[in-house]
């Protein structure tokens, strides 16, 4: 059968719109059908038929602070690929995209285990930065998948104050839409 598109991705997320990206299947296709609807919505989804040459679409007139389910099907005449499905929340509407309750849950003289509560939006990944509080040395940075809500920071100096910051990245990796960060200070 016809291969599905792959790599569903989201960017340019606002309260009323976001852009969906995907990777075309290798097979010859005539176009795509993109459907979207709010999660837990039983009505008829909105549907766009898009030419084969496109691999993105901006969905508009969305409801703020709402999780949307987006499905993409590749078409070749009457033949349809299996669904590619993704979910993305719009901004605003009282739904924050900032991680909450960042804390150190375990520590050694040279490492920290941090934990936070995920925001109520789809997070692609978290970007974590840490560095000596008030220090001149550059901060270190790493990422963890959006499915995680803990991270270990190692290689620290004993007895030093560190500032740790967690950003939720909700856009594409090459053009991240980062939330406001949450930060804490901790002395090893």
């Amino acid at each position: 059968g016809l291969d599905s598109p792959t790599g569903i991705d989201f960017s340019d997320i606002t309260a009323n719109s976001f852009t969906v990206h995907w990777i075309a299947p290798r097979a010859t296709i005539t176009g795509y059908r993109i459907r979207h609807h709010p999660e837990h919505f039983s009505g008829r989804p909105r549907e766009d038929r898009v030419p084969h040459s496109r691999n993105s679409i901006t969905l508009t007139n969305l409801t703020p602070g709402t999780e949307y389910v987006v499905s993409i099907v590749a078409l070749n005449g009457r033949e349809e690929s299996p669904l590619l499905i993704g979910q993305q929340s719009t901004g605003g509407g009282g739904v924050s995209d900032v991680p909450r309750d960042l804390e150190v849950v375990a520590a050694t003289p040279t490492s920290l285990l941090i934990s936070w509560d995920a925001p109520a939006v789809t997070v692609r990944y978290y970007r974590i930065t840490y560095g000596e509080t008030g220090g001149n040395s550059p901060v270190q940075e790493f990422t963890v998948p959006g499915s995680k809500s803990t991270a270990t920071i190692s290689g620290l100096k004993p007895g030093v104050d560190y500032t740790i910051t967690v950003y939720a990245v909700t856009g594409r990796g090459d053009s991240p839409a980062s939330s406001k960060p949450i930060s804490i200070n901790y002395r090893t």
Partner: antibody, heavy 115, light 107 residues
């Protein structure tokens, strides 16, 4: 007979706004993607935007964040809201039926951005 | 973006002449190539789509060929109403892009 009729063009200062309309008839408007294509004076054709049957959109990088395409299927009308206009946006703007193979075009409306 | 290059930029020909315009894509576009005719002060008109399929109502003296990166529009016997500017357009990948145009003038 398919007909597309643009309106709303005119002279606007840099930084200003303008809304173009395209009235469609002779086909089931709601079932088709529609596009805007522009042509600067004495120059070639440049794709501006698409809007698909469900209202989803795509834009050229040169207008992204400044132009918004919308449609009102109950009025068989396509719109192009143009904000933060620049001198380089000066062109005849055409609406065209479908994306990719532009099988029908309007007569165009001239937008001049100048102080 | 895919660049489309037409040649020649302009040509002079007489009624009855066979005219050939070429269009080259900067990368393969399969057969996703369309040709348009535009007369001064008028909107473009679709002549040929998918490289070689004649749009309904277009005279059979117009034909298109090619695939991959090299394409040709041929007018087998130029008529007075054919003096115009011709554009190619790739529809293989977004954004769709046009050639710079070929102006066909009367010799």
């Amino acid at each position: 007979e398919v007909q597309l009729l643009e309106s709303g063009g005119g002279l606007v200062q840099p930084g200003g706004s303008l809304r173009l309309s395209c009235a469609a008839s002779g086909f089931t408007f709601s079932s088709y993607a529609m596009s805007w294509v522009r042509q600067a004076p004495g120059k070639g054709l440049e794709w501006v935007s698409d809007i698909y049957d469900g209202g989803g959109t795509n834009y050229a990088d040169s207008v992204k964040g400044r132009f918004t395409t919308s449609r009102d299927n109950s009025k068989n009308t396509l719109y192009l809201q143009m904000n933060s206009l620049r001198a380089e946006d000066t062109a005849v703007y055409y609406c065209a039926k479908t994306a990719d193979n532009f099988d029908y075009w309007g007569q165009g409306t001239l937008v001049t951005v100048s102080s | 973006d895919i660049q489309m290059t037409q040649s020649p930029s302009s040509l002079s020909a007489s009624v009855g002449d066979r005219v050939t315009i070429t269009c080259r894509a900067s990368q393969s576009i399969s057969s996703y190539l369309n040709w348009y005719q535009q007369k001064p002060g008028k909107a473009p008109k679709l002549l040929i789509y998918a490289a070689s399929t004649l749009q309904s109502g277009v005279p059979s003296r117009f034909s298109g060929s090619g695939s991959g990166t090299d394409f040709t529009l041929t007018i087998s016997s130029l008529q007075p109403e054919d003096f115009a500017t011709y554009y190619c357009q790739q529809a293989n990948s977004a954004p769709t892009t046009f050639g710079q145009g070929t102006k066909v003038e009367i010799k």
